[in-house]
Interface confidence: medium
């Protein structure tokens, strides 16, 4: 299996709520001795091997911001202190899973890395991750809502937040 | 550059309507809400109302809720603002201004002046 | 609706003097996760529509003279003019944006 990031770049406004998207893609094996290990960290720009370095996002590190269940459930993380900081990460039946940011600041911006682990009791892990980069603006040229641009093409669209 | 054009000076009677475009320019249009305030003589600044023009969702000033209606034309990156029911006190320059992502209205069209009189 | 009420009306000020503009809110407009204040300040000279000059209660626009100040947090804002020059006749107006956007009545800055 491995990750695919929709967007590669989201431009958000101060003070707006974005969610950060990756995609599992591939087989994915349903067994019993198969678990999925999905996470969400912060990383530096320019490095040789991106998402190498896990820094925490507000203050909350990848553990604590992880999903831990079987093949293509969904899962939630645990809402009490993920939602102090304005976070919630999020997993759905299709593969999809996502990281939510509420209020965004300037020091959100960066470039947020996923990472899913295929943890095979009695075998070895497979991980691969996804990256992207937030850049939230301020004044009178940011944009109204987010703006993303998809990876494969240097097209926008807007996420209508209103 | 940004720049907002807005249409001529209107002249109506009273009970009618009026149609205001703003036609943007410099910039994606589809990114960025497009408002509407009004300025009637000597007086302050009222703001009408907003559309997002990438989703055409608008929300309006509840004094004119039931009076104004605001559509775009993607293809054109035009805004128009149409007010009906005029009534003399409806006699005002009309701005359209985008809006930026601090809640900021930070380019703004050259003013449309709409008279209302019998 | 949030009521924004600014003092005084009107204001002679010499050239070279300072001329401070104040902006009471009838409700707080500090967004407390982000510490933001979505108060904003416009000027407007005649015959012209009107230009940012402050956001977010305390930034200046790029381009607007440093003796364009803001302050403020909550309910009480002020916009101070450190050295009043003849380009800086106009009317002024508060605006905010916490709750939809309504503009203060304006204060209009004249020379004394």
């Known amino acids: 299996f491995k990750v695919a990031t929709p967007y590669s770049l989201y431009v958000c406004p101060e003070g707006q709520n974005v969610t950060l998207t990756c995609r599992l893609l591939g087989p994915v094996d349903k067994g019993h001795d198969v678990t999925f290990y999905k996470t969400w960290y912060r990383s530096s720009r320019g490095e040789v091997q991106t998402c190498s370095e896990r820094r925490p996002i507000r203050n909350l590190t990848f553990q604590d911001l992880h999903l831990h269940h079987g093949g293509h459930q969904a899962a939630n993380t645990s809402h009490d202190l993920a939602q102090r900081h304005g976070l919630e990460s999020a997993s759905d039946h299709h593969g999809n899973f996502s990281i939510t940011m509420r209020n965004l600041t300037l020091l959100d911006s960066g470039l947020y890395c996923c990472l899913v682990v295929e943890i095979r009791h009695h075998h070895s892990e497979h991980r691969v991750h996804g990256a992207m980069e937030l850049q939230v603006q301020t004044g009178k040229d940011a944009p109204s809502n987010c703006v993303v641009y998809p990876s494969s093409s240097q097209d926008s669209e807007n996420i209508t937040a209103a | 550059q940004v720049q907002l054009v807005q249409s001529g000076a209107e002249v109506k009677k009273p009970g009618a309507s009026v149609k205001v475009s703003c036609k943007a320019s410099g910039y994606t249009f589809t990114n960025y809400w497009m408002h509407w305030v009004r300025q009637a003589p000597g007086q302050g600044l009222e703001w009408m109302g907003y559309?997002?023009?990438?989703?055409?969702?608008?929300e309006y000033n509840q004094k004119f809720k039931d009076r104004v209606t605001m559509t775009r034309d993607t293809s054109t990156s035009t805004v128009y603002m149409e007010l009906s029911s005029l009534r003399s006190e409806d006699t005002a320059v009309y701005y359209c201004a985008r809006d930026g992502g601090s809640v900021l209205f930070g380019y703004w069209g050259q003013g449309t002046t709409v008279t209302v009189s019998s | 609706d949030i009521v924004m009420t600014q003092s005084p009306d009107s204001l002679a000020v010499s050239l070279g003097e300072r001329a401070t503009i104040n902006c009471k809110s009838s409700q707080s407009l500090l967004n407390s996760g982000i510490r933001k204040n979505y108060l904003a300040w416009y000027q407007q000279k005649p015959g012209q529509p009107p230009k940012l000059l402050i956001y977010s209660a305390s930034t200046r626009e790029s381009g607007v003279p440093d003796r364009f100040s803001g302050s403020g947090s909550g309910t009480d804002f002020t916009l101070t003019i450190s050295s009043l020059q003849a380009e800086d006749v106009a009317v002024y107006y508060c605006?905010?944006?916490?709750?939809?956007?309504?503009f203060g009545q304006g204060t209009k800055l004249e020379i004394k």
């Open positions: 559309i997002n023009p990438s989703s055409g969702y608008t």
């Open positions: 605006k905010q944006s916490y709750n939809l956007y309504t």
